[in-house]
Every structure is written in structure tokens, then in C-alpha cells.
């Protein structure tokens, strides 16, 4: 049966049996800035090109055991959520991965900047169709990271980022606080904001919308056919990156402003229980859960 | 995220160092009255002191970025400090990434073309 998260973002008409736009997102390239990935996983094999870009800090701790499957875990799962054969949102999208997070899931602002610059240079050298950049990471507020995101967005690239898992105001984190970036919070199967222990999804006026981010089934780096459930605002952002890829594939000329409007327009409204958010943040936090456009756009989205 | 609202720095720390003294060896003095600013992560555990992104003014060319980086290295060396240019940015933002002592920040902020300097910091998978 269809995983809850794909059902949640799918127009009602397509919920009958399985989620299945085979070419969804085929005109779009999605860049993933994350950990290394297991590119030969059956879910993403042939769909993800691993670039030679790598800029990561050393792992903490003297006894850290670098196990390939652990190093690849986060990125592999997200690549699967965006474009996986069985459990992906935009099954037609092609992806390129850049390694900016180490085996412990840690990176640097500078490494991320150099990664964004790499994408811009690639875009200039070989212009392709629409580009989506997925940034499933967060650090403290950074003027320079936000500025780089702004420049890339002004070059026509769509940036999607995780709101952050700190149960805090997303405006205190980057790139979540960059106005030009589409910032995504996480909700669960009950349309509740995701709780991650004491922490949970970020919130506030710097969040653009929410998307499924709890118990998301996706590719596991434990083996080439394994699946695993993961949670977080990274998973939520991956859903929106996939939806954006489908929208841009259907309408490649969409501007960032138009894409943002469409994402908001087609979202489910007022389904999130706002009591979870701090009182002063409720009015500032958008009550929107991302979804694909309805079947009136059948010819565009489900070719 | 959330377009159409002004940027909010939150707890973001900003140290503004005014440009006063004439720096030795400066062929091009900064425009009168401009102030380059220093920024660092508000969350201390995520700070990475010793590595800095020097962001130059918007229209700065790559050759000027490289020249500014070399000038910083030369002036630092005269003071007995080793520095290492890790990357020169161009394409998105003009500037460079430098490994150096925090003691050199005041000097770096006085270099021509400098808009602001940000200390490197950690980001995490979410």
C-alpha cells in the first residue's frame, strides 16, 4: 500500500492504488547537498549522479568508526524521498549529489558556500533546464550563507531547505532564515508538528510551509534493496523539492515567486494543530501542508 | 524562507570594528566612512574560530579578491602570523576563505573591498 507521506501529498484522484507519475520531474535537475550517498541503491540507481564535490570537516572523536553505510545514511534516504523508484515523490527527476556533511552529519558554512558556488559554476558552464537545490541542513544564523542563497536564487535556481529540528524559531538558523529559500517544517501522519524527543520541527515566520517528516520510508544504505524509516525537517524538505521538481517539469518557465505561490496555493490549509507552537509563534507560522496540484493538471503533472 | 519579510538576525552576534588607523602598506585605503563588520554564530558550540569567510563588496573582480587575499597574507606575515588561503570565491559572492588567528581580524577588516567577515561555523544534517 502507498506510504502515508505519499498519500498525503497526492491529489485524491490518484490515491486509489498507488502513487505513480512515472515521469514526474523529468525536465528538472535536483542538486542534493548532504552526506555521501549509496548511488547503487536500487531505489536511486541511475537517477543520481555523484559529483566529485566534497568539502567536509573531520569527524569528532578519536575512535569514530567510518562505516560506509553509516556515512551514506542521511543522503541516501533523502535522494530516495526526492526521486526513488518506489517511495520517491518525483520519480522522473535526475539528481546530483555534493558531499558537504561528514559521516556524523556535520558540515561547515564554508563548505556549504563552496558547494553552492560549485552549482552556480556548473550552471554557467552547462546550462540545463530548471534547477532545484535541496539543503537538508541547518546551522546558526549566517549572513554569508543567506547571501549566497540569495545570489543563487536570483540566478534562477530554486532552493529548498529544512526549517531545522530544534523546536525553535527558524529565523535563528541558516539557510532556513534566507528569505529567497523555500523553508520547510515537518508534520506527521496526524498533521501534527513533528516532535523529535524534547526537540522537534522549527516554526515561525521564516517557515514557508510544512510537509511530511515523520516515519518517512526511504532508501536505506544498509543494503542496495533496504528501506528504512527516518524523521526530520530534511525529509519534509525532500518532499517539497520533489513537488517543486514536478511543478517545474510541467511549467519550466515558472519564476521562484510563481512556484512559491503555487506551493502555497495547492497546500492543505489549517490542518496543523497550532497548539504545539509557542503562543507568540502561532500567528506567524504558516498553517500549510504541501501537496501536489489536483488532477485538473493531470496532463501537466502525470504524463 | 518566508519571502517578503525583512531579515532577522535573532541572537546573531555582530562586532563592528570601525576603520580608523592608517594601515601600513595599504595602497588602496577603504572609502571614507565605510565600516566592515565581523559576524559569528550566536551558538558558541557551533563556532569554528580560526577559519573566516572574508566577503568583498559586490562588484569586486576575481583578480581583486586574489590581490586582497595576498595583501592580508603579506601584512600578517610582517606581524609574524601564518595565514592560509583555503579558497577564493567567485561566481556567487566575491571573497575568500582564510585560516588565520583571530588576532588578525582588525587588520583584515581594514583591507580594501571588504564588506564583512564571518567566522566559520558548523551546520548539521536535519
Amino acid at each position: 500500500s502507498i506510504p502515508w507521506n505519499l498519500e498525503r501529498i497526492t491529489p485524491p484522484r490518484y490515491r486509489a492504488d498507488e502513487y505513480q507519475p512515472p515521469d514526474g520531474g523529468s525536465l528538472v535537475e535536483v542538486y542534493l547537498l548532504d552526506t555521501s550517498i549509496q548511488s547503487d541503491h536500487r531505489e536511486i540507481e541511475g537517477r543520481v549522479m555523484v559529483t566529485d564535490f566534497e568539502n567536509v570537516p573531520e569527524e569528532d572523536g578519536t575512535r569514530f568508526h567510518r562505516q560506509a553505510s553509516k556515512c551514506d545514511s542521511h543522503g541516501t534516504h533523502l535522494a530516495g524521498v526526492v526521486s526513488g523508484r518506489d517511495a520517491g515523490v518525483a520519480k522522473g527527476a535526475s539528481m546530483r549529489s555534493l558531499r558537504v556533511l561528514n559521516c556524523q552529519g556535520k558540515g561547515t558554512v564554508s563548505g556549504t558556500l563552496i558547494g553552492l558556488e560549485f552549482i552556480r559554476k556548473s550552471q554557467l558552464v552547462q546550462p540545463v533546464g530548471p534547477l532545484v537545490v535541496l539543503l537538508p541542513l541547518a546551522g546558526g544564523y549566517s549572513r554569508v550563507l543567506n547571501a549566497a542563497c540569495q545570489r543563487l536564487a536570483r540566478a534562477g535556481v530554486v532552493l529548498v531547505t529544512a526549517a531545522g529540528n530544534f523546536r525553535d524559531d527558524a529565523c535563528l538558523y541558516s539557510p532556513a532564515s534566507a528569505p529567497e529559500v523555500i523553508t520547510v517544517g515537518a508534520t506527521n501522519a496526524q498533521d501534527q508538528p513533528v516532535t523529535l524527543g524534547t526537540l522537534g520541527t522549527n516554526f515561525g515566520r521564516c517557515v514557508d510551509l510544512f510537509a511530511p517528516g515523520e516515519d518517512i520510508i526511504g532508501a536505506s544504505s544498509d543494503c542496495s534493496t533496504c528501506f528504512v524509516s527516518q524523521s526530520g525537517t530534511s525529509q519534509a524538505a525532500a518532499h517539497v523539492a520533489g513537488i517543486a521538481a514536478m511543478m517545474l517539469s510541467a511549467e519550466p518557465e515558472l519564476t521562484l515567486a510563481e512556484l512559491r505561490q503555487r506551493l502555497i496555493h495547492f497546500s492543505a490549509k489549517d490542518v496543523i494543530n497550532e497548539a504545539w507552537f509557542p503562543e507568540d509563534q502561532r500567528v506567524l507560522t504558516p498553517n500549510l501542508v504541501a501537496a501536489l496540484p489536483p488532477s485538473t493538471h493531470e496532463n501537466l503533472y502525470f504524463q | 524562507g518566508a519571502m517578503g519579510q525583512e531579515d532577522e538576525d535573532g541572537d546573531y552576534e555582530e562586532l563592528v570594528l570601525a576603520l580608523r588607523s592608517e594601515e601600513d602598506g595599504l595602497a588602496e585605503a577603504p572609502e571614507h566612512g565605510t565600516t566592515a563588520t565581523f559576524h559569528r554564530c550566536a551558538k558558541d558550540p557551533w563556532r569554528l574560530p580560526g577559519t573566516y569567510v572574508v566577503v568583498l563588496k559586490e562588484e569586486t573582480h576575481l583578480s581583486q579578491s586574489e590581490r586582497t587575499a595576498r595583501r592580508l597574507q603579506a601584512q600578517a606575515a610582517r606581524r609574524g602570523y601564518l595565514t592560509k588561503i583555503l579558497h577564493v570565491f567567485h561566481g556567487l559572492l566575491p571573497g575568500f576563505l582564510v585560516k588565520m588567528s583571530g588576532d588578525l581580524l582588525e587588520l583584515a577588516l581594514k583591507l580594501p573591498h571588504v564588506d564583512y567577515i564571518e567566522e566559520d561555523s558548523s551546520v548539521f544534517a536535519q
Epitope: G61, F64, G105, N165, F166, G197, S231, G232 | -
Partner: antibody, heavy 122, light 110 residues
């Protein structure tokens, strides 16, 4: 409801071994780092060990290094502490505790078990 | 010997405010997140504050945390008899690669 239940405590002679277990329920165990913390009678809290969510890294207090081993079985939602070469000064209530953050921000501990008592005495 | 120093005890009348200091160094409090824990006799500790000043849900806003340099402070306002307990600060120590707790402070309501 999030629960941590320690077991395996008891009275043991110096130099002998003991294995403590901590059964976790009510949360996604494999997403969280886990700690062991102890408290000697009438004394303060003393951190013992930390294991990351995937078991890829472990940290120990100097006082137990080389004698204690922290491990976990994510398929069984269980945390372990293997204690060898026990000494009288290891006598304490041992708590298992969940790390606050799913990743490695060293935020501290947010959920604690009720503790299990270990007495090392001849 | 703990690397984080707290006063052994503090006391105040009901309704008053108490503050508990926790003094460390740049390798712990100075560059790592501080948490505060409350422990009643014979029970497990409970998290009160994390990330210097954030409260988990269910912790009243009478409890607050702050940090300055290499010291952290827990504040309790509107003191109640139910606040009588031991309080510990805790943080990671980068030099030791271990988590460290403070010496503990007993709060007494007069």
C-alpha cells in the same frame, strides 16, 4: 509514553563483572544517543558513558575507561553497560538516559530511567 | 572532583527568587551547551533547562537559564516548597571528550 527501564544491578564482589541493561520504549530508539550516569550513595551525579544512535562512536569517563563497555542493540531497543574489574568505588545507582538531540549536539539528557543499584562489596 | 563548581546550598523564603551558579572553563561551559537537572531524594534526575535557556514542555517559566562566558546560572522565581531538591548543571567537555556534571546545589525553602 517514553520509558527507560534499567535492570541487571545487584551485589557483586570486587574484580567481578556485571552487565546492566536498559529497555527503551515509546520512542524511535535508533534515532537517539544514549548515556549511562551513576550516583554513589549521598553523592552527586557522575557521567559514565555515551553511545551514538548508530553505535558508531562511544565515549567514557576516565574512571571507567578500559573496564566498562557501552553497547546497544537497536533491533531490541536495548542499551547495555558491561562492567568488568569492578571496584568498591563503582557502588552506585546506575541510570540510563536519552540524549536530547537525535544528532550529536551534546545537549544533555532528557529522559531518565528509574535506576538500578550496583553494590560492589566483599 | 567535578570540573563544574556549584554552591553546596542556597535558600530563600517562599515566593522569593534564588539563583544557582555553575562555574567552568572554555572547554566546557564556554563552548558547549549547558543543561540543568532537578533531582528529588530517591528519584531520577529530571531535565529543567537545555541549550542554556530553553525549557522542555511542561517545565514552568519560573525556571530560567543563562550563560556568560564560562559560567551558567539557573534562576528560580516564585519559589515553592515543591522546589526543594538538588540541582545539577551539566555540559560536554571538549578537552575531556566527556559529559560533566556540576557538584550539585541543595535548594531549601525557608
Amino acid at each position: 509514553q517514553v520509558h527507560l527501564v534499567e535492570s541487571g544491578g545487584g551485589v557483586v564482589q570486587p574484580g567481578r563483572s556485571l552487565r546492566l541493561s536498559c529497555a527503551a520504549s515509546g520512542f524511535t530508539f535508533n534515532s537517539f544517543g544514549m548515556h549511562w550516569v551513576r550516583q554513589a550513595p549521598g553523592k552527586g551525579l557522575e557521567w559514565v558513558a555515551l553511545i551514538w544512535s548508530d553505535g558508531s562512536d562511544k565515549y567514557y569517563a576516565d574512571s571507567v575507561k578500559g573496564r566498562f563497555t557501552i553497547s546497544r542493540d537497536n533491533s531490541k531497543n536495548t542499551l547495555y553497560l558491561q562492567m568488568n574489574s569492578l571496584r568498591a568505588e563503582d557502588t552506585a545507582v546506575y541510570y540510563c538516559a536519552r540524549a536530547i538531540a537525535a544528532l550529536y549536539y551534546y545537549y544533555g539528557m532528557d529522559v531518565w530511567g528509574q535506576g538500578t543499584t550496583v553494590t560492589v562489596s566483599s | 572532583q567535578s570540573v563544574l563548581t556549584q554552591p553546596p546550598s542556597v535558600s530563600a523564603a517562599p515566593g522569593q527568587k534564588v539563583t544557582i551558579s555553575c562555574s567552568g572553563s572554555s572547554s566546557n561551559i564556554g563552548n558547549n551547551f549547558v543543561s540543568w537537572y532537578q533531582q528529588f531524594p530517591g528519584t531520577a534526575p529530571k531535565l529543567l533547562i537545555y541549550d542554556y535557556n530553553k525549557r522542555p514542555s511542561g517545565i514552568p517559566d519560573r525556571f530560567s537559564g543563562s550563560k556568560s562566558g564560562t559560567s551558567a546560572t539557573l534562576g528560580i522565581t516564585g519559589l515553592q516548597t515543591g522546589d526543594e531538591a538538588d540541582y545539577y548543571c551539566g555540559t560536554w567537555d571538549s578537552s575531556l571528550s566527556s559529559y560533566v556534571f556540576g557538584t550539585g546545589t541543595r535548594v531549601t525553602v525557608l
